[in-house]
């Protein structure tokens, strides 16, 4: 399986909300002995590889933001803890999972990573990740809404 990032760059005005998205691709084993753990964290384009370093998102660690379930089941993070920080991560039945960040500030700018671990009980753990950049802008040059740039091309889309 693979992880796709529909958008590689999100450019948002200060104060806006944004939802960063990843998608699980490929054959997903829905067997009893396979589960998936998904999480989010901040990182940097490191010397070893992108997303190798795991930093908190608004003081919430990747442990706090873990989603854990089998196959394409839906899941949400602990609402109280995440929402106190203006965050919510979620996963649907179709392999999409996301993190929503509310009331963006300039400090939210940076590289964000989604991580999926496929746990085949009695056998192995396999991990894949996706990366995307968030730029929070302020002032007259800032867009009125978030503008997202697809990973496959440089065409941009406005999202409200």
């Amino acid at each position: 399986f693979k992880v796709a990032t529909p958008y590689s760059l999100y450019v948002c005005p200060e104060g806006q909300n944004v939802t960063l998205t990843c998608r699980l691709l490929g054959p997903v084993d829905k067997g009893h002995d396979v589960t998936f753990a998904k999480t989010w964290y901040r990182s940097s384009r490191g010397e070893v590889q992108t997303c190798s370093e795991r930093r908190p998102i608004r003081n919430l660690t990747f442990q706090d933001l873990h989603l854990h379930h089998g196959g394409h089941q839906a899941a949400n993070t602990s609402h109280d803890l995440a929402q106190r920080h203006g965050l919510e991560s979620a996963s649907d039945h179709h392999g999409n999972f996301s993190i929503t960040m509310r009331n963006l500030t300039l400090l939210d700018s940076g590289l964000y990573c989604c991580l999926v671990a496929e746990i085949r009980h009695h056998h192995s753990e396999h991990r894949v990740h996706g990366a995307m950049e968030l730029q929070v802008q302020t002032g007259k040059d800032a867009p009125s809404n978030c503008v997202v740039y697809p990973s496959s091309s440089q065409d941009s889309e406005n999202i409200t």
Epitope: D33, A37, Q63, H66, H68, A117, H121, S124
Partner: antibody, heavy 117, light 107 residues
Amino acid sequence: QVQLQESGPGLVKPSETLSLTCTVSGGSISSYYWSWIRQPPGKGLEWIGYIYYSGSTNYNPSLKSRVTISVDTSKSQFSLKLSSVTAADTAVYYCARDIPAFAFDIWGQGTMVIVSS
Amino acid sequence: EIVLTQSPATLSLSPGERATLSCRASQSVSYYLAWYQQKPGQAPRLLIYDAFNRATGIPARFSGSGSGTDFTLTISSLEPEDFAVYYCQQRINWPLTFGGGTKVEIK
């Protein structure tokens, strides 16, 4: 802050069943994996197995025929049962939180179990 | 089962010296390797995950490196509280396994 606390008898007779419980406090048991790990006196660490809150388990093949790990989410507890014990099962038994794509990040303080008649 | 072999079994050093601990896997574990520190009478404490990432609250003098089958834990300048036993652990395959440990003792 999540904390783990092991409890159970410190002395078990040979051929009997060792039973331990780990209580999770300060956080939810309804995510992550919850493992048992043991350490014989003066020796290294051995992973026994884990349970997920849904009840799915994974055991070390070397112990699988004798091990049962169960969970009681209403009490935020998970338990270890090891049957037909011998002196070789004498060890400090630890419970630990296991996060996929990470590690054993939180451990109980451990409880010494001696197998002796 | 993946066997992790740690060397040396014992390392005798003085405070302020550099400690280099090795962990070798019987087959590739990619970078899915953690290091733990254990002091007498205490539970192990996570130091490093994914071969080189420091866990929360771990001082910068601890660093990890390696991938595949050969890994190193380095303590750049030993503090008195660093004298302990160190274990590596892999999590690419089950059963999860630990190395036999390296004891870092005061010379």
